[in-house]
Interface confidence: medium
């Protein structure tokens, strides 16, 4: 069964900067990736970025840069303009879609006791799975 992993890390040099890393583990080619925060896409979450392997990317504040790392993984840099660092307690979700086979989504957040620059292990927490 395909799985999605999500990692959230705080940048060591800038405590107001976060990076979300997401990856797809499974067969098939990915045709669209959606990153949201505050919950799963379409279930209370707010879109931060949409990435297409050929058509490019779209992103919305506070997303700073969305990019493909490999054919099946992406990263999204976030700029936290507020002093209170709301990202620390936020859930980030990544949905990988392979049209028209299905889509798979998992969520993750910054570990409570994370040291800046250290990332959490990629623990997949499936939210939605294709039938």
């Amino acid at each position: 069964t395909p799985e999605v992993w999500v990692q959230v890390q705080m940048e060591a040099t800038e405590l107001s900067s976060f990076t979300v890393h997401c990856g797809f583990l499974g067969p098939g080619s990915i045709s669209l990736v959606t990153v949201s925060w505050g919950g799963p896409d379409g279930a209370g979450g707010t879109k931060l970025a949409v990435l297409h392997p050929e058509l490019g990317t779209r992103q919305w504040a506070p997303a700073r840069q969305a990019r493909w790392e490999t054919q099946s993984s992406i990263s999204l840099a976030l700029e936290d303009s507020g002093a209170s660092s709301p990202f620390a307690n936020t859930t980030f979700c990544c949905k990988f879609a392979s049209f028209p086979e299905g889509s798979w989504e998992s969520c993750g957040s910054l570990p409570p006791s994370s040291d800046p620059g250290l990332s959490a292990p990629p623990t997949p927490v499936p939210i939605l799975r294709a039938d």
Partner: antibody, heavy 120, light 106 residues
Framework: EVQLVESGGGLVKPGGSLKLSCAAS????????MSWVRQTPAKRLESVAT????????YYPDTVKGRFTVSRDNAKNTLYLQMSSLRSEDTAMYYC?????????????WGQGTSVTVSS | QIVLTQSPAIMSASPGEKVTMTCSAS?????MYWYQQKPGSSPRLLIY???NLASGVPVRFSGSGSGTSYSLTISRMEAEDAATYYC?????????FGAGTKLELK
């Protein structure tokens, strides 16, 4: 201007075959997945075939699997639907539609349709 | 495959009236779309990804929902809105449509 124009429909006997075409213009055809969707006389919509932009992957519901074949010629900007072993329940208006990636694969443009009647 | 049930099957509304129609899915849906079809015409995309308005669609149309329950709302009915409305899902293949809600002008 995006345009999809279907052709090839007509009257055919049960067990017969028919090949539909959809001529695309106004966009980069090879960048988009495409589908054939039919509308029955009862006005129900049913997706009968989907093909990815490169033409390698094809998908069919069980109702037409093994009888219908979708293909595309990206050089000619044309989508095809080969239908065989036709049944009376295949009688419908057949539309081709484009899937827009950034609209989450919604079918954002449809052709005007071509009518297929299967009757003896 | 996912079955979509639209209700009501037929409804009528007066100009200026608020209209809401629903689409219920047999299991959780990843992506929901709404289309409008008028007699003699092809379906036209209204809403994609549950709540986003397609290009050229009047802002009186809105979509909402999640999981298995979705709805399409017209804030103020206009004569040109008389049509049949279809919901469609993509979660996994096959793509499926609801049977439609026919909206008539009262």
């Amino acid at each position: 201007e995006v345009q999809l124009v279907e052709s090839g429909g007509g009257l055919v006997k049960p067990g017969g075959s028919l090949k539909l075409s959809c001529a695309a213009s106004g966009f980069t055809f090879s960048s988009f997945a495409m589908s054939w969707v039919r509308q029955t006389p009862a006005k129900r919509l049913e997706s009968v075939a989907t093909i990815n932009n490169g033409g390698i992957n094809t998908y069919y519901p069980d109702t037409v699997k093994g009888r219908f074949t979708v293909s595309r010629d990206n050089a000619k900007n044309t989508l095809y639907l080969q239908m065989s072993s036709l049944r009376s329940e295949d009688t419908a208006m057949y539309y081709c539609a484009r899937h827009d990636d950034f609209l989450y694969y919604a079918m954002d443009y449809w052709g005007q349709g071509t009518s297929v009647t299967v009757s003896s | 495959q996912i079955v979509l049930t639209q209700s009501p099957a037929i409804m009528s509304a007066s100009p200026g009236e608020k209209v809401t129609m629903t689409c219920s899915a047999s299991s959780s849906v990843s992506y929901m779309y709404w289309y409008q079809q008028k007699p003699g015409s092809s379906p036209r995309l209204l809403i994609y990804d549950t709540s986003n308005l397609a290009s050229g669609v009047p802002v009186r149309f809105s979509g909402s929902g999640s999981g298995t329950s979705y709805s399409l709302t017209i804030s103020r009915m206009e004569a040109e809105d008389a049509a049949t409305y279809y919901c469609q899902q993509w979660t996994s293949y096959p793509l499926t449509f609801g049977a439609g809600t026919k909206l008539e002008l009262k």
